[in-house]
């Protein structure tokens, strides 16, 4: 089981849309796949994929999930808010008959405020 996630870095404007993609490659057949998206270490959602369909379609605030067989899981954030900024990780597991799990690399999402002056203030607030 392997998980590839992209993009590594995503910068979007507040109010627009962000799409994070997770590709789950499993060389063998699985009856049920458990997937999980986390943001900054906190679980956003952990649905199951059974017979090609997702057990739920929402994932965190303003997050929508979709599964495109055979291997693509998409998290779409729309509309994006400043609170969506953070580090996103996709994780997948086949649970039976034996636990196999894998996770992708981090996708860092940066959300720019609609108001450019707000953006300047935010940048200025970082030391150094």
């Amino acid at each position: 089981l392997s998980v590839q996630q992209g993009p590594n870095l995503l910068q979007v404007r507040q109010g627009s849309q962000a799409t994070l993609v997770c590709q789950v490659d499993q060389a063998t057949a699985w009856e049920r796949l458990r997937v999980k998206w986390t943001k900054d270490g906190a679980i956003l959602c952990q649905p199951y994929i059974t017979n090609g369909s997702l057990s739920l379609g929402v994932c965190g605030p303003q997050g929508r999930l979709s599964w495109q067989a055979p291997s693509h899981l998409t998290l779409q954030l729309d509309p994006v808010s400043l609170n969506h900024s953070g580090a996103y990780v996709c994780w997948a597991a086949v649970e039976i008959p034996e636990l196999e799990e894998a996770e992708g690399n981090i996708t860092r999402l940066f959300v720019d405020p609609d108001d450019p002056t707000q953006n300047r203030n935010r940048i200025a607030s970082f030391p150094g």
Epitope: A27, T28, K36, E95, I96, P97, E98, L99, E100
Partner: antibody, heavy 120, light 112 residues
Framework: EVQLVESGGGLVKPGGSLRLSCAAS????????MSWVRQAPGKGLEWVSS???????YSPDSVKGRFTISRDNAKNSLYLQMNSLRAEDTAVYYC??????????????WGQGTLVTVSS | DIVMTQSPLSLPVTPGEPASISCRSG???????????LHWYLQKPGQSPQLLIY???NRFSGVPDRFSGSGSGTDFTLKISRVEAEDVGVYYC?????????FGGGTKVEIK
């Protein structure tokens, strides 16, 4: 030392309900898949239900829609809610732990069992 | 459902002698991930079952090395190299390759 202690068994009428509990100790409960296996009097073993570390549930068709497995990691407890009970559900019900973190479908530790009798 | 057939149903043994139990499955137990999920349990008189062997040939922790498992596909064997008095009980094979997971009917091992 790993300990699994079942409770909640007893005599119930056909069509009735019962909730079994399994109190676990001696290991990190949340890191293991847990299962229920039953044994009718004088008979062999039958798998009833399993729940993964993440809460995914697996059951044979014979109990789907009637039995519900659940877990409370904060209380180190496993449960089996049994509804619409039938005479053929009469058995000793064992709580069993996956053999290790990855071994979700073979059972390394078993409780002493609790007897469920379905009879009018 | 996968039917697991064990033989013999009863096995009288002499302490110090070897013993062998056969288990056959209705279809291949080779999973698509190339592993074979065939396990052996022992239920001693008046006790709960205990795991002896998992995935055909792996001894579970604390299981004496006189127990060994072998086989492939649909035919599997549990061997006890030298039976001891404490080995009496009912031995079950079990498969978890296919849902629902199923057990064999058991083989009762008793001292002659």
């Amino acid at each position: 030392e790993v300990q699994l202690v079942e409770s909640g068994g007893g005599l119930v009428k056909p069509g009735g309900s019962l909730r079994l509990s399994c109190a676990a100790s001696g290991f990190t409960f949340s890191s293991y898949a847990m299962s229920w296996v039953r044994q009718a009097p004088g008979k062999g073993l039958e798998w009833v239900s399993s729940i993964s570390q993440g809460g995914g549930t697996y059951s044979p068709d014979s109990v789907k829609g009637r039995f519900t497995i659940s877990r409370d990691n904060a209380k180190n407890s496993l449960y089996l809610q049994m509804n619409s009970l039938r005479a053929e559900d009469t058995a000793v019900y064992y709580c069993a732990r996956g053999a290790d973190y990855y071994g979700t479908s073979w059972f390394g530790n078993w409780g002493q069992g609790t007897l469920v009798t379905v009879s009018s | 459902d996968i039917v697991m057939t064990q033989s013999p149903l009863s096995l009288p043994v002499t302490p110090g002698e070897p013993a062998s139990i056969s288990c056959r499955s209705g279809q291949s137990l080779v999973h698509s991930n190339a592993n074979t999920y065939l396990h052996w349990y022992l239920q001693k008189p008046g006790q709960s079952p205990q795991l002896l062997i998992y995935k055909v040939s792996n001894r579970f922790s604390g299981v004496p090395d006189r127990f060994s498992g072998s086989g492939s596909g649909t035919d599997f064997t549990l061997k006890i190299s030298r039976v001891e008095a404490e080995d009496v009980g009912v031995y079950y094979c079990s498969q978890s390759t296919h849902v629902p997971w199923t057990f064999g009917g058991g083989t009762k091992v008793e001292i002659k």
